[in-house]
């Protein structure tokens, strides 16, 4: 039995930051779980891990240098990413593993979310106005 995951097909990070919500067909309340976010078609880069184990507080970390935070809903984990770079535009996949109570459960691979990181563009300065006519 696999958990189903729903994600937005695409998100745009305008200010180098984005919130990605992973919605599960499973209630995480009072469960020990490991939710993670992976980058790339092959999910090769583990961007962020959110670990929950009954306590009210989530443990959040990244082994790959991403600035992330997480928020837990009954059937969702929202990943907050900051300081993203344009070259980190990619497809991102949510993953969930429930360790306790048995049985161990994980998810069917989702369709993923394309995160498009927009560079910061400076507004062009207005042209210097010429001398006013008398």
């Amino acid at each position: 039995n696999k958990i189903l995951v729903k994600q937005s097909p695409m998100l745009v990070a305008y200010d180098n930051a984005v919130n990605l919500s992973c919605k599960y067909s499973y209630n995480l309340f009072s469960r020990e779980f490991r939710a993670s976010l992976h980058k790339g078609l092959d999910s090769a880069v583990e961007v962020c891990v959110v670990y929950g184990n009954y306590s009210q507080q989530l443990q959040v970390y990244s082994k790959t240098g991403f600035n992330c935070d997480g928020k837990l809903g009954n059937e969702s984990v929202t990943f907050y990413l900051q300081n993203l770079y344009v070259n980190q535009t990619d497809i991102y996949f949510c993953k969930i593993e429930v360790m306790y109570p048995p049985p161990y459960l994980d998810n069917e691979k989702s369709n993923g979310t394309i995160i498009h990181v927009k560079g910061k563009h400076l507004c062009p300065s207005p042209l210097f106005p010429g001398p006013s006519k008398p």
């Epitope: 989530l58 992330c68 770079y85």
Partner: antibody
Framework: EVQLVESGGGLVQPGGSLRLSCAAS????????MHWVRQAPGKGLVWVSR????????SFADSVRGRFTISRDNAKNTLSLQMNSLRAEDTAVYYC?????????????WGQGTLVTVSS | EIVLTQSPATLSLSPGERATLSCRAS??????LAWYQQKPGQAPRLLIF???NRATGIPARFSGSGSGTDFTLTISSLEPEDFAVYYC?????????FGQGTKVEIK
């Protein structure tokens, strides 16, 4: 005026436990992420842990993960660091610092620090 | 994690002189770099954030510049109270990391 005042430091044996506290005043405590940063005698600054503004998530440096826990009481404007299984290398001055919730690791105010000495 | 290397380790100068401190990152941190001042027995104090923005109450003689991997803190004319240790810190990548410090001492 923003004030952060740490307490709870002292001498503890290896393997022992200690709980540090940080009392905050002069700002809306619940709007800020809070951090612990330490400094071993004569050494540089090392980030230890953080907690988000509502206390629902936390992160730890690899060197302390599994041994330290962080918590906050927004009603009492206090931050705590529970340190277990202490080692000699945990000897340091521990500072609490605040960071705006929009720029999580930008430490704009620091406390004066509390010294933790782990020795037998 | 990102390693920040500060140079020189010690800078010996006289009051009124210009101080130039360097911080180099092992990979790009964009402009997510801060500078702190620490005096003996005191807590660090934020001087500059996001590479070039002065923190509240910091005198104009302190300025920061740079982006990517190379950053500079400049003190245009040293005052007696500026002799201290200066640390850079990045918040681009997790975990946040600090440089090892540059001590500015009286010549």
């Amino acid at each position: 005026e923003v004030q952060l005042v740490e307490s709870g430091g002292g001498l503890v044996q290896p393997g022992g436990s200690l709980r540090l506290s940080c009392a905050a005043s002069g700002f809306t405590f619940s709007s800020y992420w809070m951090h612990w940063v330490r400094q071993a005698p004569g050494k540089g600054l090392v980030w230890v842990s953080r907690i988000n503004n509502d206390g629902s998530s936390a992160s730890f440096a690899d060197s302390v993960r599994g041994r330290f826990t962080i918590s906050r009481d927004n009603a009492k404007n206090t931050l705590s660091l529970q340190m277990n299984s202490l080692r000699a290398e945990d000897t340091a001055v521990y500072y609490c610092a605040r960071a705006d919730s929009s720029s999580w690791y930008h430490f704009d105010y620091w406390g004066q620090g509390t010294l933790v000495t782990v020795s037998s | 994690e990102i390693v920040l290397t500060q140079s020189p380790a010690t800078l010996s100068l006289s009051p009124g002189e210009r101080a130039t401190l360097s911080c180099r990152a092992s990979q790009s941190v964009s402009s997510y770099l801060a500078w702190y001042q620490q005096k003996p027995g005191q807590a660090p104090r934020l001087l500059i954030f996001d590479a070039s923005n002065r923190a509240t109450g910091i005198p104009a003689r302190f300025s920061g510049s740079g982006s990517g991997t190379d950053f500079t803190l400049t003190i245009s004319s040293l005052e007696p109270e500026d002799f201290a240790v200066y640390y850079c810190q990045q918040r681009s990548n997790w975990p946040p990391t600090f440089g090892q410090g540059t001590k500015v001492e009286i010549k």
